[in-house]
């Protein structure tokens, strides 16, 4: 089996305030098995924005079913953007621990801007 | 400059066999899954098969099941078509394709090649 | 097997018009795995938008997608003379990997 890869393609989306953004990733592998989660920043300060594991997201949806079989897909939609959402978004693979999951690889991450709502 | 060169294509009787090759240049092939997709003359576009960039799965279109085999030599950077048992309807023109990502099969296919045309007739 | 439907099969338009051309699914689809392109005649097709929604490089603004489920859509909002040619959807994902027939933009 290949080694996993998490692939984000955009490096930059840029979104009208108050439009949706979709933050696109996907895996290369099924293996290992574990949650995916996305963050917003880096680090020990990075702020998690969806967990598939657990926890509620109000404004955050899945592009695919997350728990279709043989799903690679693990892109989301942030709705009503605002300027405070700008960042670089990552979307991090674990690998199923005990008694905690383990960070297992990132992806390059996405830097999403923010625009002007039109007039 | 990102590129795919076809050949292989040519006139082959009822029930012959032609070999398809494509020639990658200017990025990491064996990093991309790849995909051959066919044209009959004045019909749309008809997707074939497909391959991981490992060339460990490999995936087909009913049309073509049991007939065309796909592969690859990432060495050699060049993805081949086996058509076996051809018949009237596989003739057209051949297209390889990369697909955009690394993950197989997600969000499209954005390299083509011009395409090499199969005409089977006897 | 999803079957993908494109309709209109030919829309004949001005330079300058808007084009809004629809691809419908056979049963929902996830937009990741939906794409579209465009032919010219003796060329090959080109990517034109990805995951339903996003432009591919090199595609201009005036090309965009949108839609979900079973709906999807490309307008093209003012048509250039370059943009008369064959669009095709796709659906990826899974196997097949099945094209749309077709919509073709000819001048009016």
């Known amino acids: 089996e290949d080694e996993l890869q998490v692939i984000q393609p955009e490096k930059s989306v840029s979104v009208a305030a108050g439009e949706s953004a979709t933050l696109r990733c996907a895996m290369t592998s099924l293996i290992p098995v574990g949650p995916i989660m996305w963050f917003r920043g880096a680090g020990a300060g990075r702020e998690l924005i969806y967990n598939q594991k657990e926890g509620h997201f109000p404004r955050v949806t899945t592009v695919s079913e997350l728990t279709k079989r043989n799903n690679l897909d693990f892109s989301i939609s942030i709705s009503n953007i605002t300027p405070a959402d700008a960042g670089t978004y990552y979307c991090v693979k674990f690998r199923k621990g005990s008694p905690d999951d383990v960070e297992f690889k990132s992806g390059a991450g996405t830097e999403l801007s923010v625009r002007a709502k039109p007039s | 400059e990102v590129q795919l060169v076809e050949s292989g294509g040519g006139l082959v009787k009822p029930g012959g066999s032609l070999r398809l090759s494509c020639a990658a240049s200017g990025f990491t092939f064996s990093a991309y899954g790849m995909n051959w997709v066919r044209q009959a003359p004045g019909k749309g576009l008809e997707w074939v098969s497909a391959?991981?960039?490992?060339?460990?799965?490999?995936y087909y279109a009913d049309s073509v099941k049991g007939r065309f085999t796909i592969s690859r030599d990432n060495s050699k950077n060049t993805l081949y078509l086996q058509m076996n048992s051809l018949r009237a309807e596989d003739t057209a023109v051949y297209y390889c394709a990369k697909d955009f990502t690394e993950v197989v099969g997600w969000l499209g296919m954005d390299v083509w090649g011009q395409g090499t045309t199969v005409t089977v007739s006897s | 097997e999803i079957v993908m439907t494109q309709s209109p099969g030919t829309l004949s338009l001005s330079p300058g018009e808007r084009a809004t051309l629809s691809c419908r699914a056979s049963q929902s689809v996830s937009s990741s795995y939906l794409a579209w392109y465009q032919q010219k005649p003796g060329q090959a097709p080109r990517l034109l938008i990805y995951?339903?929604?996003s432009r591919a490089t090199g595609i201009p603004d005036r090309f965009s997608g949108s839609g979900s489920g079973t709906d999807f859509t490309l307008t093209i909002s003012r048509l250039e003379p370059e943009d008369f040619a064959v669009y095709y959807c796709?659906?990826?994902?899974?196997?097949?990997?099945?094209f749309g027939g077709g919509t073709k933009v000819e001048i009016k």
């Open positions: 796709q659906l990826l994902g899974s196997s097949p990997r099945t």
């Open positions: 995951g339903a929604s």
């Open positions: 391959i991981t960039s490992s060339g460990r799965s490999t």
